[in-house]
């Protein structure tokens, strides 16, 4: 299996909402033997590999924002310690899963990482991971909504629908 | 605070049976996978049995199978560590320490003695 | 089961030297490797994951490399609270398994 990164890069006013997405792709076992592992981290791009290094988003750590289960199976993170941070990681049905950020600030731009472990019981666990930048903007050069950008171009795409600006 | 606290060691007839106990504070303890650890008397680190968050899957190293048995209880944030026909090599500090998917053992207890002795 | 075999067995050095810790796979391992010091007496301590990312709290003075099968962990000046045993993890199958320790000591 793999995991795809739909946008590449996602530049957000301050105060914005977003939600940073990556897809699990190609053959998922669904057996009682297998299980899956997903949490979400701030990284830096490495010198030898992007993502290797691990550190908390908002003060949160890939512990605290992980997603345990079998195959496609939906979850949500534990809410309370992430909603008190502004933070909420879920998964569908369908491989989809995305980690939300309430009330964007400066301090949020960077790398971020997504993370899946596939673990065949007995046997091994097998490591995937995507990334994505994400750049805060302020003042009169930043949009007034999030704009994403996908990975396999730079086609840019507005994303206002999905994301509501965060009222104070 | 975040912390493991080991129990249950002692000295135990070759032959013998022990429990060992391992009492987690300050952290969500049915988040993680947890493992016991041994280490013989002025020797290296041997990786013993480790549970999953859940309970299940259950792993062993080959030395120890069918001897011993590792169990959890979320409700009590405590992990288990039955032991039977212990033997002289089992003579060890016994360690648990907490794993995760794709990660390491960041956090360890002080351990807790085990003598297999006639 | 993959075998890990650390070198030196020993490391005899003083305050202020380097420190070159070499840890060796039977087979390749990726970049699943951990190291952790040991103090007499105390519990070991994760120093660094994924071959080379240090653990959190940990000083910069500890830096490690390595890919597949050969491991490097080094302290670029030994501090008097770097003496200690040191040891290298796998996580890349089961059974988990660690090397057998260097020992850093004081000259």
């Known amino acids: 299996f793999k995991v795809a990164t739909p946008y590449s890069l996602y530049v957000c006013p301050e105060g914005q909402n977003v939600t940073l997405t990556c897809r699990l792709l190609g053959p998922v076992d669904k057996g009682h033997d297998v299980t899956f592992y997903k949490t979400w981290y701030r990284s830096s791009r490495g010198e030898v590999q992007t993502c290797s290094e691990r550190r908390p988003i908002r003060n949160l750590t890939f512990q605290d924002l992980h997603l345990h289960h079998g195959g496609h199976q939906a979850a949500n993170t534990s809410h309370d310690l992430a909603q008190r941070h502004g933070l909420e990681s879920a998964s569908d049905h369908h491989g989809n899963f995305s980690i939300t950020m309430r009330n964007l600030t400066l301090l949020d731009s960077g790398l971020y990482c997504c993370l899946v472990v596939e673990i065949r019981h007995h046997h091994s666990e097998h490591r995937v991971h995507g990334a994505m930048e994400l750049q805060v903007q302020t003042g009169k050069d930043a949009p007034s909504n999030c704009v994403v950008y996908p990975s396999s171009s730079q086609e840019s795409e507005n994303i206002t629908a999905h994301h509501h600006h965060h009222h104070h | 605070q975040v912390q493991l606290v080991e129990s249950g060691g002692g000295l135990v007839k070759p032959g013998g049976s022990l429990r060992l106990s391992c009492a987690a504070s300050?952290?969500?303890?049915?988040?993680?996978?947890m493992s016991w650890i041994r280490q013989a008397p002025g020797k290296g680190l041997e990786w013993v049995s480790e549970i999953s968050n859940s309970g299940s899957p259950i792993y062993y190293a080959d030395s120890v199978k069918g001897r011993f048995t590792i169990s959890r209880d979320n409700a009590k944030n405590s992990l288990y560590l039955q032991m039977n026909s212990l033997r002289a090599e089992d003579t060890a500090v016994y360690y648990c320490a907490r794993d995760l998917p794709g990660w390491y053992f960041d956090l360890w207890g002080r351990g807790t003695l085990v003598t297999v002795s006639s | 089961e993959i075998v890990l075999t650390q070198s030196p067995a020993t490391l005899s050095l003083s305050p202020g030297e380097r420190a070159t810790l070499s840890c060796r796979a039977s087979q390749s391992v990726s970049s699943y490797l951990a190291w952790y010091q040991q103090k007499p007496g105390q519990a070991p301590r994760l120093l660094i994951y994924?071959?080379?990312n240090r653990a959190t709290g940990i000083p910069a003075r500890f830096s490690a490399s390595g890919s597949g099968t050969d491991f490097t962990l080094t302290i670029s000046s030994l501090e008097p609270e770097d003496f200690a045993v040191y040891y290298c993890?796998?996580?890349?199958?089961?059974?988990?398994?660690f090397g057998q320790g260097t020992k850093v000591e004081i000259k």
């Open positions: 994924d071959a080379s």
């Open positions: 993890q796998q996580r890349n199958n089961w059974p988990r398994t």
């Open positions: 300050g952290f969500t303890f049915s988040d993680y996978y």
